[in-house]
Interface confidence: medium
C-alpha cells in the first residue's frame, strides 16, 4: 500500500524533537500529494503531447473542475478563513470523482495514482476536523458522480488523455492555492 506522510519511519519524530502541529501535518500532506501529482504528470507528458498544448486550447473543455476565485476568500486580497476553508474542503470533495477516474489511466505510476487518491481522502478528514463548526460544506451526490465517471470513461483516447492532463493540472493549481491559504490559518 502507498505510504502516507506520517506513516513512513523517516517521519517518526527523533527524541526531543517537536511533534508536528496539525497545521504542519496538513502542510506536509499537501506537499506529499503535490509530489505525487508531479510524478503522474511526468508519465502523462511522456505518452502524449497534451503538455505542449496551449492553456487557451485546453480551456475549451466541458469539465467543471473546481477552481479558486476571488469570492472564495482564499487569496490575500479579501482573505476569509471560514469561507476559504469551506471552499477548500468542498473543492477536494468535488475532485474525488476525478481522482477515481485517474485510477485506470496509468501504467508505470499506478501505485502513485492510488497514493494521491488515498492521501486526498486523508487530507479531507484532517480539514473536516479543522472545520467542525462549519456547516456550509456540500458533498457531491453519489449518483451524479457515478454518471460523470461513466461519461468520462466513455470518451475516445484523445479526449481521455486531455481529461487526464486537465485534471492533474487543475488539481495541482487548486492544491497550491489551498496550501498557501492554509498557511494563513
Amino acid at each position: 500500500a502507498p505510504v502516507l506522510p506520517g506513516e513512513d519511519s523517516k517521519d517518526v519524530a527523533a527524541p526531543h524533537s517537536q511533534p508536528l502541529t496539525s497545521s504542519e501535518r496538513i502542510d506536509k500532506h499537501i506537499r506529499y500529494i503535490l509530489d505525487g501529482i508531479s510524478a503522474l504528470r511526468k508519465e502523462t507528458c511522456n505518452r502524449s503531447n497534451m503538455c505542449e498544448s496551449s492553456k487557451e486550447a485546453l480551456a475549451e473543455n466541458n469539465l467543471n473542475l473546481p477552481k479558486m476565485a476571488e469570492k472564495d476568500g482564499c487569496f490575500q486580497s479579501g482573505f476569509n478563513e471560514d469561507t476559504c476553508l469551506v471552499k477548500i474542503i468542498t473543492g477536494l470533495l468535488e475532485f474525488e470523482v476525478y481522482l477515481e477516474y485517474l485510477q485506470n489511466r496509468f501504467e508505470s505510476s499506478e501505485e502513485q495514482a492510488r497514493a494521491v487518491q488515498m492521501s486526498t481522502k486523508v487530507l479531507i478528514q484532517f480539514l473536516q476536523k479543522k472545520a467542525k463548526n462549519l456547516d456550509a460544506i456540500t458533498t457531491p451526490e453519489p449518483t451524479t458522480n457515478a454518471s460523470l465517471l461513466t461519461k468520462l470513461q466513455a470518451q475516445n483516447q484523445w479526449l481521455q488523455d486531455m481529461t487526464t492532463h486537465l485534471i492533474l493540472r487543475s488539481f495541482k493549481e487548486f492544491l497550491q492555492s489551498s496550501l498557501r491559504a492554509l498557511r494563513q490559518m
Epitope: K28, S77, Q176, R180, R183
Partner: antibody
C-alpha cells in the same frame, strides 16, 4: 499598471538615520503585504523586512532587528522603512517589493521598484 | 534565517538548456520562486510556486522542486537570458524571506 517608486536614500554617517518611502500605485495597496529587499554593491539580494496588508504584523532579518522599523500608511498608499543606528554594511540599493497574491506566510515578489541608494560612510 | 545555496556561475551555449539549482533552507516544505536580474535593473519574477510562470515570461523558463532542491530550467537559452538568477523562499516559520546567493548565467556564442 503597477508602479513602486522609492525615495529617501542618500549618504549618511555611521550611527545616523534615514527614512525610506515607497509610493505605490496601480493596485489596491491596502490588500497586499509589502517588503523591503536590499542589494549591497556587487552582492546578492537580501530580504530586510516585511509588513502584512493591514500593518499589524511585521518581520525583520536578524541583521536589522532592533534598528529598522517597517510601517505603512494605507490612506497614502505608501510604505516606509525607518533606519536607525546605520552601519557601513547597510550600504546598498534598497528595493520596495509588492508581495504576490499569495499569503503573508509564503511570500513571492511580483513587482519591484527601481530602488534607492543608501550609502553609510564617514 | 537559513541560507539557500546556488552555484555562483553557469555558462550555456546559445540555444542549449541551462539548469540552475537551489537547495537548503526549508525548500522541502516551502515554495521556491525565481528572479532574473540584469545589470542596473530591478529583479523580475520568472517562476513562482516551484513551477508556475507569470504571464509575459517566455515558455522556455520552467521550474521544478523535489526533495529540498529547486531547479530553474531555461530551454533554448537566448542571449537576452544572460544575467543573475536568484531563488527565494520563506523560512520554516514563514516569518522571514530567504534568497539564494545568486547565479550569474553567461550565454555563449
Amino acid at each position: 499598471e503597477v508602479q513602486l517608486v522609492e525615495s529617501g536614500g542618500g549618504l549618511v554617517q555611521p550611527g545616523g538615520s534615514l527614512r525610506l518611502s515607497c509610493a505605490a500605485s496601480g493596485f489596491t495597496f491596502s490588500s497586499y503585504a509589502m517588503s523591503w529587499v536590499r542589494q549591497a554593491p556587487g552582492k546578492g539580494l537580501e530580504w530586510v523586512s516585511a509588513i502584512n496588508s493591514g500593518g499589524g504584523s511585521t518581520s525583520y532579518a536578524d541583521s536589522v532587528k532592533g534598528r529598522f522599523t517597517i510601517s505603512r500608511d494605507n490612506a497614502k498608499n505608501t510604505l516606509y522603512l525607518q533606519m536607525n543606528s546605520l552601519k557601513p554594511e547597510d550600504t546598498a540599493v534598497y528595493y520596495c517589493a509588492k508581495e504576490g497574491d499569495t499569503g503573508w506566510k509564503d511570500p513571492m515578489y511580483d513587482y519591484w521598484g527601481q530602488g534607492t541608494q543608501v550609502t553609510v560612510s564617514s | 534565517q537559513s541560507a539557500l545555496t546556488q552555484p555562483s556561475a553557469l555558462s550555456v551555449t546559445l540555444g542549449q538548456t541551462a539548469k540552475i539549482t537551489c537547495q537548503g533552507g526549508s525548500l522541502g516544505t516551502r515554495y521556491a520562486h525565481w528572479y532574473q536580474q540584469k545589470p542596473g535593473q530591478a529583479p523580475v519574477l520568472v517562476i513562482y510556486d516551484d513551477d508556475s510562470r507569470p504571464s509575459g515570461i517566455p515558455e522556455r523558463f520552467s521550474g521544478s522542486s523535489s526533495g529540498g532542491r529547486a531547479t530553474l530550467t531555461i530551454s533554448g537559452a537566448q542571449a537576452e537570458d544572460e544575467g543573475d538568477y536568484y531563488c527565494q523562499s520563506a523560512d520554516s516559520s514563514g516569518n522571514a524571506s530567504v534568497f539564494g546567493g545568486g547565479t550569474h548565467l553567461t550565454v555563449l556564442g
